[in-house]
């Protein structure tokens, strides 16, 4: 027989199957060109001295063989005597150590046995009832396939799975979805219902993120408020990178985790927009307001758990930057303007109360007045800061109030509301003898002293009822006692105390009469 032909004679070895565990297996035959065919198989066991024979039986019952020698792959043409247009039965017999080992048989029509393409192009990945669904367009003119997948994680080897039979222009597969680790998938196809047909190559890797994106482990720090009333939010720790399987390392579309920064400005609730979402890489500048910051991780399956931080308000105060004038029509605030066409947000809340009780007012965009000041006025009827108590005021400014990250702090300060001059009058003024010509005057702290920076000083006035002479003594706002000396015994005096702010003179307390008794010597 010619080597290129299938030999229709008895093979050159005895016909007996040893039934041993080793031997040929996994025979695959397919058409490789218009007129050529290839069969290949695996051989289990020691290969030394093994001769392989590809056996073929036609539908007529006639059988032939090709001698492959030690090779486990053999090509032949459509002129080799094998009927390619009709069904044939093929198997391999391996002659080794004086015994014959036989592979399982495959029955197929060689003419139509083409090697399929793997899924090509775009493989769409989605989540379906806790599983992974992959979908792709069937390669043209290859409808009718068996599909397998294999998958691995960064720490596990390949595992094989079955997608089942496919018979449409689109094919799909349900695969396991891991909760917390990324996976690499590959798919392959072969002709449906064709015994012994060859699997395609594996597809390109499909990289799939875990169902839950990793929780971002990041830390923030906030810089000091700068001269421009803004402070930078900086990232102290980058989010941990997802560990990827081997085929997904480098460029792995599909496994990307995106981290977004969600800012919620808690202060100034009357502004138009309170939240803004940014990319984590773009760290924003913030005003001195209080913020909640959340880092949201998400992948192609949606958002995961987020991590939230509270950034407290910057409480650094500027006691002199704000002027307040109280008139009969109402109250006006003045402060150094930031720039042209600025919107200001004035926020106030009673000191010592929950931050949720802040009230605010938004101005229309305004230009500086001739003195370079910005203003905000309100009437007594509005009730704004009308109670006689200490308020914490913060003024924010923005040229683009709709953009959350463009607000800056103009100033933060304290203000005593209502009729501060009367409310601040010191009470419980008492006079005690101190020496032969001096007394000690004490009083209870003014209500204004509860308001940091508001009380400028106390003034103690002493009036000599005989001569009508008056002396005034300034006292530090932190003190509530003064010693009046150079007094004369037997003279009647009255003493009063008032509390002044930077812009208001206080109301005198009720006059307190006293005198130093004349000492009689023995």
């Amino acid at each position: 027989c010619r080597t290129s032909e299938c030999c229709f004679q008895d093979p050159p070895y005895p016909d007996a199957d040893s039934g041993s565990a080793s031997g040929p297996r996994d025979l695959r035959c397919y058409r490789i060109s218009s007129d050529r065919y290839e069969c290949s198989w695996q051989y289990e066991g020691p290969t030394a001295g093994v001769s392989h024979f590809l056996r073929c039986c036609l539908s007529s019952g006639r059988c032939c063989y090709f001698a492959a020698g030690s090779a486990t792959r053999l090509q032949f043409s459509d002129q080799a005597g094998v009927s390619v247009l009709y069904t044939v039965t093929l198997w391999v017999e391996s002659w080794a150590r004086n015994q014959t080992e036989k592979s399982p048989e495959v029955t197929l029509q060689l003419y139509n046995s083409v090697k399929y393409e793997p899924p090509l192009g775009d493989i769409k990945v989605s989540k379906l009832a806790g599983q992974l669904r992959m979908e792709w367009e069937t390669p043209d003119n290859q409808v009718g396939a068996e599909v397998q997948f294999r998958h691995r994680t960064p720490s596990s080897p390949w595992k094989l799975g079955d997608c089942g039979p496919q018979d449409d222009d689109t094919e799909s597969c349900l695969c396991p979805l891991e909760m917390n680790v990324a996976q690499e998938f590959q798919l392959r196809r072969r002709q449906l219902g064709s015994q012994g047909s060859s699997w395609s190559k594996w597809s390109s890797p499909v990289c799939v993120p875990p169902e839950n994106p990793p929780q971002p482990q990041v830390r923030f720090s906030v810089e000091q408020l700068g001269q421009d009333g803004r402070r930078r939010l900086t990232l102290k720790e980058q989010p941990t990178q997802l560990e990827l399987p081997e085929g997904c390392q480098g460029l792995a579309p599909g496994t990307e985790v995106t981290y977004r920064l969600q800012l919620h400005m808690l202060s100034c609730p009357c502004k138009a927009k309170a939240t803004r979402t940014l990319h984590l890489g773009k760290m924003p500048y913030l005003s001195g307001a209080a913020y909640n910051v959340a880092v949201i991780s998400s992948n192609q399956f949606g958002p995961g758990l987020n991590q939230t931080w509270h950034i407290p308000a910057d409480t650094h105060t500027e006691p002199v930057a704000l002027n307040i004038s109280v008139g009969t029509n109402g109250t006006t605030m003045y402060w150094p303007a930031r720039a042209q066409s600025m919107t200001y947000c004035i926020e106030w809340q009673p000191v010592g109360q929950d931050g949720g009780l802040a009230t605010c007012s938004l101005t229309a965009p305004q230009d500086p007045d001739p003195a370079g000041m910005a203003t905000y006025s309100w009437s007594r009827e509005s009730g704004a800061m009308g109670q006689e108590k200490c308020y914490y005021i913060t003024i924010f400014a923005s040229a683009h109030p709709e953009k959350l990250t463009l607000w800056s702090t103009v100033l933060s300060t304290y203000h005593f509301g209502g009729n501060a001059s009367a409310a601040g009058t010191p009470h419980h003024v008492s006079v005690k003898n101190h020496s032969l010509d001096s007394v000690s005057v004490d009083w209870a702290p003014s209500l204004l002293s509860t308001c940091p920076g508001v009380l400028k000083e106390y003034v103690v006035r002493c009036r000599d009822e005989d001569s009508k002479q008056v002396s005034e003594h300034p006292v530090q706002p932190t003190e509530t006692q003064v010693t009046l000396s150079g007094l004369r015994a037997g003279v009647a005096y009255t003493v009063q105390v008032r509390a002044d702010t930077a812009w208001l003179r206080g109301v005198w307390s009720q006059p307190q009469r006293f005198s130093i008794e004349v000492q009689v010597s023995d």
Epitope: S34, L85, V114, Y116, Q142, V143, G144, S194
Partner: nanobody
């Protein structure tokens, strides 16, 4: 459904050439192979050749081998199969039909294994 339309038939001289085309539209991705058959009055349809679309593998009947060539071109939702006929003989005179099959077990010599057919185009070879 798949629709097949042939074109290019006509009169040719002995020894001359002619090219037939077959345009397939509709659910073309599901077609496995397209072939040509011919028929002369009073006789059965006989195979000319076939092409397996995904690979471009061809089959030719012995009577046309070396003279006829089948090729295919794919566009979105349309496949065009061509039959180039050279060294034409008078016995090539027939109505030529384009056919398509969707099954992987079909035999290119058996007309009944093709699900879709064109309306046919006449080829006449005169001396």
């Amino acid at each position: 459904e798949v629709q097949l339309v042939e074109s290019g038939g006509g009169l040719a001289q002995t020894g001359g050439s002619l090219t037939l085309s077959c345009a397939a539209s509709g659910r073309t991705p599901s077609i496995v192979a397209m072939g040509w058959f011919r028929q002369i009055p009073g006789k059965d349809r006989e195979p000319v050749g076939e092409i397996i679309l995904s690979k471009g593998f061809t089959y030719y009947a012995d009577s046309v081998k070396g003279r006829f060539t089948i090729s295919r071109a794919n566009a979105k939702n349309t496949i065009t199969m061509s039959l180039q006929m050279h060294s034409l003989k008078s016995e090539d005179t027939a109505v030529y039909y384009c056919a398509a099959r969707q099954n992987w077990s079909g035999n290119p010599t058996r007309p009944n294994e093709y699900e879709y057919w064109g309306q046919g185009t006449q080829v006449t070879v005169s001396s």
